[in-house]
């Protein structure tokens, strides 16, 4: 048997081209110079290498760059990026948004993989904060990206970046995340007029406190029920029937369909039945007439 570790005569690769697809895996390993591969990485994607051949090429790069690939190579990895492990990616220093875009493009249409999550983490940590351009890019590829971050991570998002956020980017956010994002959004949109402001802030209202909801109720915003149902229960409870009526406008009729669900259910329990009756919706479960309501939380605070 021929010892298959040395490159056969005449097979040394002079450039990365289509002829290499007919090289055996061991020939690729023996005949393709790693430095040549690194300088011509952009050609690899145009060549229909098999999955196994790509592994050999990756192995060559790993040997050439044991401390991690330089950005000049990373930017042109293309489909070879799908071969990288999170451990490989942790060795990288990615600073260019163009490099990030190029790699996200490779994974486009698939859900966020551990590799992509690691890449984004490395990139954001390298930048120090989630700037608008980065957020723009990430949410374009992964609408749910923002909601995958912890409240601590979200705290590094500057208010200016909030302009890049679309309503669908917040679909999977929980109240803790919206608590962090809402004040940033309020700051970002503070110079807008009433109706425009409401359109922009609406997606973030799951983090709004009671006083902001009271203020909105004075602006004829006509909040839809879907938005209302996402509000913090503790923020909705202190609202009066009149305030909720003003907040929802014509959508107030939708309360009947949601009377058994939070926060509507809990809000009903806190209202006088007399007041609820003024809505004419047949909402039941309010405080009966003649009962005295003691706000124990206020009493505790005073003592």
């Amino acid at each position: 048997e021929v010892e298959k570790t040395a490159c056969p005569s005449g097979k040394k690769a002079r450039e990365i081209d289509e002829s290499l697809i007919f090289y055996k895996k061991w020939e690729l390993e023996a005949c393709v110079d790693a430095a040549l591969l690194a300088t011509q990485m952009d050609r690899v994607n145009a060549i229909p290498f098999t999955y196994e051949q790509l592994d050999v090429l990756k192995h060559k790069l790993d040997e050439l760059y044991p401390q991690g690939y330089p950005e000049s190579v990373i930017q042109h990895l293309g489909y070879l990026f799908l071969k990288m492990s999170p451990e490989d990616i942790r060795k990288w220093n990615v600073t260019s948004l163009e490099t990030l875009k190029a790699l996200l493009e490779v994974n486009k249409g698939h859900e966020m993989s551990p590799q992509v999550a690691t890449l984004i983490d490395r990139f954001v940590k390298g930048r120090g904060q989630l700037d608008k351009d980065t957020l723009d890019t990430l949410t374009a590829f992964y609408p749910g990206y923002l909601c995958s971050l912890s409240p601590e991570e979200l705290s590094s998002v500057p208010p200016s970046s909030i302009w890049a956020v679309r309503p669908q980017d917040l679909d999977t956010c929980d109240p803790r995340q919206l608590d962090v994002l809402y004040p940033k959004a309020r700051l970002a949109f503070q110079n807008m007029n009433g109706s425009e402001y409401f359109v922009k802030i609406q997606s973030f209202l799951g983090g709004a406190p009671t006083e902001d909801l009271k203020a909105l109720s004075q602006q004829n915003v006509s909040m839809d029920l879907a938005t209302f149902m996402k509000l913090r229960t503790d923020a909705v409870l202190p609202l009066t029937v009149a305030e909720v009526q003003k907040l929802l406008g014509p959508h107030v009729e939708g309360l009947k369909a949601e009377e058994r669900h939070r926060p509507v259910r809990d809000w009903i329990l806190r209202q006088r039945q007399d007041d609820l009756d003024t809505l004419g919706l047949g909402l039941q479960g309010g405080i009966p007439n003649g009962y005295l309501v003691l706000d124990l939380s206020m009493q505790e605070a005073l003592s």
């Epitope: 048997e1 570790t5 098999t50």
Partner: antibody, heavy 122, light 110 residues
């Protein structure tokens, strides 16, 4: 003289797991690819997958997720972990070495072990 | 996905006959093809690699040819010990394929 000896076969219930071992001698796992192939009674050869000299693994489409190939170079042993076994997994399981010293499956499998029988039945 | 089709599935022949077995790949695999012989109760025996190169110790009556998609294994003069089942195997792409082996051809005594 290169030798391969499979072990770990036997009777297993549907839904169960089994780990087969392939002890090798006469060559180094860091220089050769190693594969697993099975053969149901009276049927043809069915490729499961292989592990290259550098440890990258490749599987038949039907084996992905349920079957895992690994190796321990220091113990000169290759493993096949089989999960969620079904009656149709009943077969003789062969381990085989990549025939070339290039470390990948480039030329075929040679030599082969004698095989170990796995029966999946309740 | 890359698949291998072998024909015929079985054939009967006499000692001394010339026997030809065909193997077809669903896409071009260059010359990345191996052939095996298997007898009942035994593991397969490696016969040919790179479509036409004889493995060590294999008698010269065995030969292989072909490239691209169509391949042939020929036994020039069948011997008593050659009655067995023969399999082709593509080694072009071994990842995420249904099977790298052909369906097999059983050679029996006429």
């Amino acid at each position: 003289q290169s030798q391969l000896v499979e072990s770990g076969g036997g009777l297993v219930q549907p839904g169960g797991s089994l780990r087969l071992s392939c002890a090798v001698s006469g060559f180094s796992l860091s220089s050769y690819a190693m594969g697993w192939v099975r053969q149901a009674p009276g049927k043809g050869l069915e490729y499961i997958g292989y592990i290259s000299k550098i440890g990258t693994t490749y599987y038949a489409s039907w084996a992905k997720g349920r079957f895992t190939i690994s190796k321990d170079n220091s113990k000169n042993t290759v493993y096949l972990q089989m999960n969620s076994l079904r009656a149709e997994d009943t077969a003789v399981y062969f381990c085989a070495r990549g025939s070339s010293s290039g470390g990948y499956l480039d030329d075929g499998f040679d030599p082969w072990g004698q095989g170990t029988l796995v029966t999946v039945s309740s | 996905a890359l698949q291998m089709t072998q024909s015929p599935s079985s054939l009967s022949a006499r000692v001394g006959d010339r026997v030809t077995i065909k193997c077809q790949a669903s896409q071009s695999i260059s010359n990345y093809l191996a052939w095996y012989q298997q007898k009942p109760g035994k593991p397969p025996k490696f016969l040919i690699y790179d479509a036409s190169d004889l493995a060590s110790g294999v008698p010269s009556r065995f030969s292989g040819s072909g490239s691209g998609r169509d391949f042939t294994l020929t036994i020039s003069s069948l011997q008593p010990e050659d009655f067995a089942t023969y399999y082709c195997q593509q080694v072009y792409d071994s990842n995420n394929v249904e099977n790298v082996f052909g369906t097999g051809t059983k050679v029996t005594v006429l």
